[in-house]
Amino acid sequence: FNISGCSTKKLLWTYSTRSEEEFVLFCDLPEPQKSHFCHRNRLSPKQVPEHLPFMGSNDLSDVQWYQQPSNGDPLEDIRKSYPHIIQDKCTLHFLTPGVNNSGSYICRPKMIKSPYDVACCVKMILEVKPQTNASCEYSASHKQDLLLGSTGSISCPSLSCQSDAQSPAVTWYKNGKLLSVERSNRIVVDEVYDYHQGTYVCDYTQSDTVSSWTVRAVVQVRTIVGDTKLKPDILDPVEDTLEVELGKPLTISCKARFGFERVFNPVIKWYIKDSDLEWEVSVPEAKSIKSTLKDEIIERNIILEKVTQRDLRRKFVCFVQNSIGNTTQSVQLKEKRG
């Protein structure tokens, strides 16, 4: 098809070589002032189209994306040639950064419903560059955390080194939907809820004497609970004695609840105390048996092939620790009577 009638948009993706980041292209820009996006050639600029063929309608999931090869070859279907690019409804997701993503991307509806729809397409010229300015070493991350129940903010990585006063107007999207009230380089959240989690996109315009570009950055925001203020607690064993049968195999389980920590280095281990001696036991790897936003429940077992008389004189101690502190629970084995 002839792409000369497509509306054109230029985008710039400046990626950090230090971090993994994603990028997105939207097939349409659902802003009221973009209503000429799928302009119908017969309308004068003052006329308002009565219905835009696929803007804001359900057809949006039914768009086709192409890349225009720089050598003038025919358009290539994104889905067939680019495994690191994923189409999700009307959004194109670039999973890995790199200058090889530079190029022209075209999207149009799959269903052409009328002769006017032929020109209903968008051409996006994407330029991808690695970040060079070392002047801003504290630029916002492309992965940002918000603390549930508290006040927080989401910063636009490409503008986070500028003060609010000198920052240009920013257009924000969350999960592909325009956030029309947000225009600054930072979204302030008065109280963080789990629905604030998602993929945020911030755009601003950068112009020179020749042309203007949309500078875009993508931020993955997750909502987290605050770091625990508690040391882990041992859920099992509860009792400090355990009845056993001599000569039989035995497994003692230690289950501990660890509260959330952003930097999480849990310790859960078994050691044996025998009179004045104590030593750590080589036991199977610890495993999580439950995982929630607030905590991980981690289990580690000690396995005795057969219980001996000597084991009855020993104490088996489970030791658990996080950055706050540690807890222990000891178990004394007692021979079952009768």
Epitope: E285, S288, L293
Partner: nanobody, 115 residues
Framework: DVPLQESGGGLVQPGGSLRLSCRAS????????MGWYRQAPGEQRHLVAT???????NYGDSVQGRFTISRENNGNVVELQMHSLKPEDTAVYFC?????????WGQGTQVTVSS
């Protein structure tokens, strides 16, 4: 975040087999749930298979009987053995882990089934 490293994608003929592997590094314990999801062009991400440390396995409808998920010594390596592959299995396959109740995703590995 816990980094997930995937390997084993590629091009395979219909009816062929492929094995995907994913390792979660830097964690001092076995993560509760690990698994695989896939995303075909123009579609949402769909469950392929997951396995918990308790041995509970869950498969997506379309792969039941053809794909097998396993965890090496119940540790932080999850493997997906795929047999009788069909063109409709073509997708980007993402490793997934649940860590403090949150989804963690790998970068994805492309699987293409084509003659």
């Amino acid at each position: 975040d816990v980094p997930l490293q995937e390997s084993g994608g590629g091009l395979v003929q219909p009816g062929g087999s492929l094995r995907l592997s994913c390792r979660a590094s830097g964690v001092g314990f076995s993560i509760y749930t690990m698994g695989w999801y896939r995303q075909a062009p123009g579609e949402q991400r769909h469950l392929v298979a997951t396995v918990t440390t308790g041995g509970h396995i869950n498969y997506g409808d379309s792969v039941q009987g053809r794909f097998t998920i396993s965890r090496e010594n119940n540790g932080n390596v999850v493997e997906l053995q795929m047999h009788s592959l069909k063109p409709e299995d073509t997708a980007v396959y993402f490793c997934n882990a649940i860590y403090f109740g949150q989804d963690i995703w790998g970068q994805g590995t492309q699987v293409t089934v084509s003659s």
